[in-house]
Interface confidence: medium
């Protein structure tokens, strides 16, 4: 707590300007009016206040707005935002995308801090859903943002927002997250033609069920191995050798290099060896000829 001391004669601040940077902590406290600071917040960014001076300025705003800052002040916080705690931010009501952008800009180039995470959470909750413009903004600043959300949080993403998602935004998503996003993407891109549809849906295919992979195999999509390796194992297992060959097209040769890795390894174990041999890749580990193949999933369903 900064002690209350009288402002020395002639030092009362008439505006927020560079002359204040040589004010000592107690002088700032005594000579800068909180209301003046609030109305001239946009100037703070253009003045290189020190670490301790920023504490004083924050303290003045906290006293002026004990229930939380108004958006007119929040939008112009600039680097003073970095002094805010998650507890401070929870008191805010941020509704403008411009305010969000201005504060994310301050943290640009750094990992998502607890302050930023709290700000985003407040903003999204205030909006009720992750609309396209918000998602666009968040993924521009934090490509991994989408994958940091829980499947429950992702369920509030409307299909229309999926258009804002870039392939790199999904790099760190796990299968549970893709399970939620894939149906939304399928819906969002449903009116596109075959090749365009595949380009858009490709990044989301880690959440695709078997029947959709079978349908894709009929469309000459030539899926690359990197995409194939990210597919759900349970969705790949029921595919026949012919379907995988059609799905991968010229990329089918890449299966040899991946034969020890999932889902390729598990898929090989489910195929007849003579079917695998038709690929001419030397894939080994299939079911030997003459063995009876029991479809255990069918058996479980019957029992």
């Amino acid at each position: 707590e900064v002690e209350k001391t009288a402002c020395p004669s002639g030092k009362k601040a008439r505006e927020i300007d560079e002359s204040l940077i040589f004010y000592k902590k107690w002088e700032l406290e005594a000579c800068v009016d909180a209301a003046l600071l609030a109305t001239q917040m946009d100037r703070v960014n253009a003045i290189p206040f020190t670490y301790e001076q920023l504490d004083v300025l924050k303290h003045k705003l906290d006293e002026l707005y004990p229930q939380g800052y108004p958006e007119s002040v929040i939008q112009h916080l600039g680097y003073l935002f970095l002094k805010m705690s998650p507890e401070d931010i929870r008191k805010w009501n941020v509704t403008s995308l411009e305010t969000l952008k201005a504060l994310l800009e301050v943290n640009k180039g750094h990992e998502m801090s607890p302050q930023v995470a709290t700000l985003i959470d407040r903003f999204v909750k205030g909006r009720g859903q992750l609309d396209k413009d918000t998602l666009d903004t968040l993924t521009a600043f934090y490509p991994g943002y989408l994958c940091s959300l829980s499947p429950e949080e992702l369920s509030s993403v409307p299909p229309s927002s999926i258009w804002a998602v870039r392939p790199q935004d999904l790099d760190t998503c796990d299968p549970r997250q893709l399970d939620v996003l894939y149906p939304k993407a399928r819906l969002a891109f449903q009116n596109m033609n075959g090749s365009e549809y595949f380009v858009k849906i490709q990044s989301f295919l880690g959440g695709a069920p078997t029947e959709d992979l079978k349908a894709l195999s009929q469309q000459n999509v030539s899926m690359d191995l990197a995409t194939f390796m990210k597919l759900r194992t349970d969705a790949v297992l029921p595919l026949t050798v012919a379907e995988v060959q059609k799905l991968l097209g010229p990329h089918v040769e890449g299966l040899k290099a991946e034969e020890r890795h999932r889902p390729v390894r598990d898929w090989i174990l489910r195929q007849r060896q003579d079917d695998l041999d038709t690929l001419g890749l030397g894939l080994q580990g299939g079911i030997p000829n003459g063995y009876l193949v029991l479809d255990l999933s069918m058996q479980e369903a019957l029992s």
């Epitope: 000592k24 253009a46 020190t50 670490y51 301790e52």
Partner: antibody
Framework: QVQLVQSGAEVRKPGESLKISCKGS????????IAWVRQMPGQGLEWMGI????????IYSPSFQGQVTISADTSISTTFLQWRSLKASDSAIYYC?????WGAGWFDPWGQGTLVTVSS | AIQMTQSPSSLSASVGNRVTITCRAS??????VAWYQQKPGKPPKLLIS???SLESGVPSRFSGSGSGTDFSLTISSLQPEDFATYFC?????????FGGGTKVEIK
């Protein structure tokens, strides 16, 4: 990447004027504070002052106030440090450096330095 | 102005040694301290900000600690490329000031 490139070494006589430069690239030049730091031969580092190129309003360390002038030209992304009348004691390496953080913080990156020699 | 007193002004050490450099501020400055490394003929290079926050790309053998008035930079296992001069800097209040430097030499 963020880079600061300084003008070359200078040799001057006492009483002469001099203007050295620091060109920024790889970031928004207008929106970052640039500082000038002096290092006298075999000595430590001294902060001289800073400028916010967006409004070209320099702030000087009390020790350097009135001794030098800091300016900027945003059209060529360049900051300048100048002397009207050099003294032998101005001989030093001068570095420009970007404030790596908001406000008054630490410096990163630094220019390669400009060696100024003042000798009769 | 806040004075930053660095010690020692020089030290000799061998590769693999643990080295600690200290910096004392003339008044409390929270954790508003940065550390730099400077090699002959080169500009300083930022190692640590906020007293202990390691910059990206800086080897983990470097670490910083302290708050208030006493700060230290530690190199856990000195490598040949670490022989240089190290400076501390306070950014708590104006004018920004640096320590006098510590030269780390090969024993």
């Amino acid at each position: 990447q963020v880079q600061l490139v300084q003008s070359g070494a200078e040799v001057r006589k006492p009483g002469e004027s001099l203007k050295i430069s620091c060109k920024g690239s790889g970031y928004s030049f207008r929106d970052s504070w640039i500082a000038w730091v002096r290092q006298m031969p075999g000595q430590g580092l001294e902060w001289m002052g800073i400028i916010f190129p967006g409004d070209s309003n320099p702030i000087y360390s009390p020790s350097f106030q009135g001794q030098v002038t800091i300016s900027a030209d945003t059209s060529i992304s360049t900051t300048f440090l100048q002397w009207r009348s050099l003294k032998a004691s101005d001989s030093a390496i001068y570095y420009c450096a970007r404030h790596a953080a908001w406000g008054a913080g630490w410096f990163d990156p630094w220019g390669q330095g400009t060696l100024v020699t003042v000798s009769s | 102005a806040i004075q930053m007193t660095q010690s020692p002004s020089s030290l000799s050490a061998s590769v693999g040694n643990r080295v600690t450099i200290t910096c004392r501020a003339s008044q409390g400055i929270s954790s508003a301290v940065a550390w730099y490394q400077q090699k002959p003929g080169k500009p300083p290079k930022l190692l640590i900000s906020y007293a202990s926050s390691l910059e990206s790309g800086v080897p983990s053998r470097f670490s910083g600690s302290g708050s208030g008035t006493d700060f230290s930079l530690t190199i856990s296992s000195l490598q040949p490329e670490d022989f240089a001069t190290y400076f501390c800097q306070q950014f708590n209040s104006y004018p920004l000031t640096f320590g006098g430097g510590t030269k780390v030499e090969i024993k």
